[in-house]
């Protein structure tokens, strides 16, 4: 997977008036890395590993960048003409990537009230607009505003692409991201399935990076793909990931089965525990965490794109 840096900024308006402040999160390699603390008006690292990336350096540069981006986005929202009564949001997601072959990608996406209306490839400067008439109107509105000073805009996009990659390279240089490995915690449970059968579920949690093999083995050999059910590998909100695999087996045959886990060049095997079978089967909920963003998002049901 490529290394990536992802900026996620949102500004709000109420009854046509753009609100002060903004919400911002930065993801590094898909993990929550920074967020903008509106109380302290500063960029704050998300967890110890994020702190380790910059070591003893300050987060002034990040604070300055996020503040500037937030200001720009508020100005953009102010130029959107069709703002009606009530709460509205403008969200900008900017991503840059460095691939294994050292090639790069950068893009920028705008959402209004949770709906994508404008995308741009920051390398080719090519714009993409969804087909809907609302998106077309919004896109024209925003593009016109952004193009008011054509030369400034051209410089602006090249700079955004270059700055994002420069920051990403700076973070990668610390080696923390590249070296970081958190082995999974693995837990096996059993639950009632149907007459004579039980479902055994193997959960792996709190691991990084996200690449993992989790599979059931019978008498030492991996079960075929179609006899197992896998959950998605999802962020768990702590800068790590979680996933699960389940299979249905005959009651009394539990000891023939082992959950096999492989992560970052290491593996482990996890047998099915003996004891009472759980009657209630509780698979993990497949919801995306909002990583502690402002409650207004939850309260106003504003869609958050990840």
């Amino acid at each position: 997977e490529p290394h990536s840096l992802r900026y996620n900024l949102t500004v709000l308006s109420w009854d046509g008036s753009v609100q002060s402040g903004f919400l911002a999160e930065v993801h590094l390699d898909g993990q929550p890395f920074l967020r903008y603390d509106r109380q302290k008006c500063r960029a704050k690292p998300q967890g110890q590993w994020a702190e380790d990336v910059l070591g003893n350096k300050t987060w002034d540069r990040e604070t300055r960048d996020l503040t500037g981006n937030g200001k720009d986005l508020r100005m953009t929202l102010a130029h959107i003409k069709d703002q009606k009564e009530g709460l509205h949001s403008l969200q900008e997601i900017r991503v840059c990537e460095i691939h294994e072959d050292n090639s790069t990608r950068s893009s920028q996406h705008f959402y209004y009230d949770g709906e994508l209306f404008l995308s741009q490839n920051l390398e080719t400067e090519e714009w993409t607009v969804p087909q809907s008439s609302r998106a077309q109107t919004l896109a024209m509105n925003v593009r016109n505003f952004l193009k008011e000073d054509a030369m400034k805009t051209k410089t602006h996009y090249h700079a955004m692409h270059a700055d994002c990659l420069q920051e990403l390279r700076r973070y990668l240089e610390s080696g923390v991201v590249l070296r970081r490995t958190v082995p999974p915690m693995v837990n096996v449970t059993r639950s009632e399935a149907s007459e004579g059968n039980i479902t055994v579920t193997c959960r792996a949690s709190s691991f990084y990076p996200r690449n993992i093999i989790l599979t059931w083995r019978q008498d030492g050999v991996s079960l075929s793909h179609d006899t197992q059910q896998w959950g998605d590998v999802l962020p768990d909100g702590n800068g790590t990931y979680q996933t699960w695999v389940a299979t249905r087996i005959c009651r009394g045959e539990e000891q023939r089965f082992t959950c096999y886990m492989e992560h970052s060049g290491n593996h482990s095997t996890h047998p099915v525990p003996s004891g009472k079978v759980l009657v209630l089967q509780s698979h993990w909920q497949h919801h995306h965490h909002h990583h502690g963003l402002n409650d207004i998002f939850e309260a106003q049901k504003i869609e958050w794109h990840e």
Partner: antibody, heavy 117, light 107 residues
């Protein structure tokens, strides 16, 4: 039939390294995990670690991390264990074995390692 | 790490006798216990796995039992070929440890 054929006895100097091999036959080599076990003269058995020959992933007993390195060659259906910085404490018989789920079903015949100056 | 305590460490018995070897785990190993027999200069041979399942080709005079933390291997009507060392091993969580062994000798 399943067979695990280990390399012959080794007499080596302290401080050097040695690589013990374990050639599997009679089954699909990449389907099963291979484990390694140490037995000092007149002593009990100690699990060193295991390898998945298909992927090369390993699982070590903490005690043997830095001492043993497990590898496997799919093309020759052979698992290897390299032991480094040898001392007299490493003098032992080393067994490879096939993990048949939640037990070891098949064992190699053992390789005797003697570390002596 | 789970510690397996095997007893007795050595045992003298006559052909035809019945003997029992026990293996106590320091934690619940959920029946993931195997028993092996080892003759001098040879590799261990699987006798019993999953605490009570007899491996292929193992005579029925051998039997395994137990659960939780307490397990035992029973040999009925000892035969001359049964003499040697016996080890238990758990497979609940790594490191997979062995018991200290029981040396069964002819009286």
């Amino acid at each position: 039939q399943v067979q695990l054929q280990q390399s012959g006895a080794e007499l080596v100097r302290p401080g050097t390294s040695v690589k013990v091999s374990c050639k599997a036959s009679g089954y699909a080599f990449t389907d099963y995990l291979i484990e390694w076990v140490k037995q000092r003269p007149g002593q009990g058995l100690e699990w060193i670690g295991g390898i998945n020959p298909g992927s090369g992933s390993t699982n070590y007993n903490e005690k043997f991390k830095g001492k043993a390195i497990l590898t496997a060659d799919k093309s020759s259906s052979t698992a290897y264990m390299q032991l480094s910085s040898l001392t007299s404490d490493d003098s032992a018989v080393y067994f490879c074995a096939r993990l048949d789920g939640n037990y070891v079903g098949y064992w190699g015949q053992g390789t005797t390692l003697t570390v002596s100056s | 790490d789970i510690l397996l305590t095997q007893s007795p460490a050595s045992l003298s018995a006559s052909v035809g006798e019945t003997v029992t070897i026990t293996c106590r785990a320091s934690g619940n190993i959920h029946n993931y216990l195997a028993w092996y027999q080892q003759k001098q200069g040879k590799s261990p041979q699987l006798l019993v796995y999953h605490a009570k399942t007899l491996a292929d080709g193992v005579p029925s005079r051998f039997s395994g039992s137990g659960s939780g933390t307490q397990y035992s291997l029973k040999i009925n009507s000892l035969q001359p070929e049964d003499f040697g060392s016996y080890y238990c091993q758990h497979f609940w969580s790594t490191p997979w440890t062995f018991g200290g062994g029981t040396k069964l000798e002819i009286k």
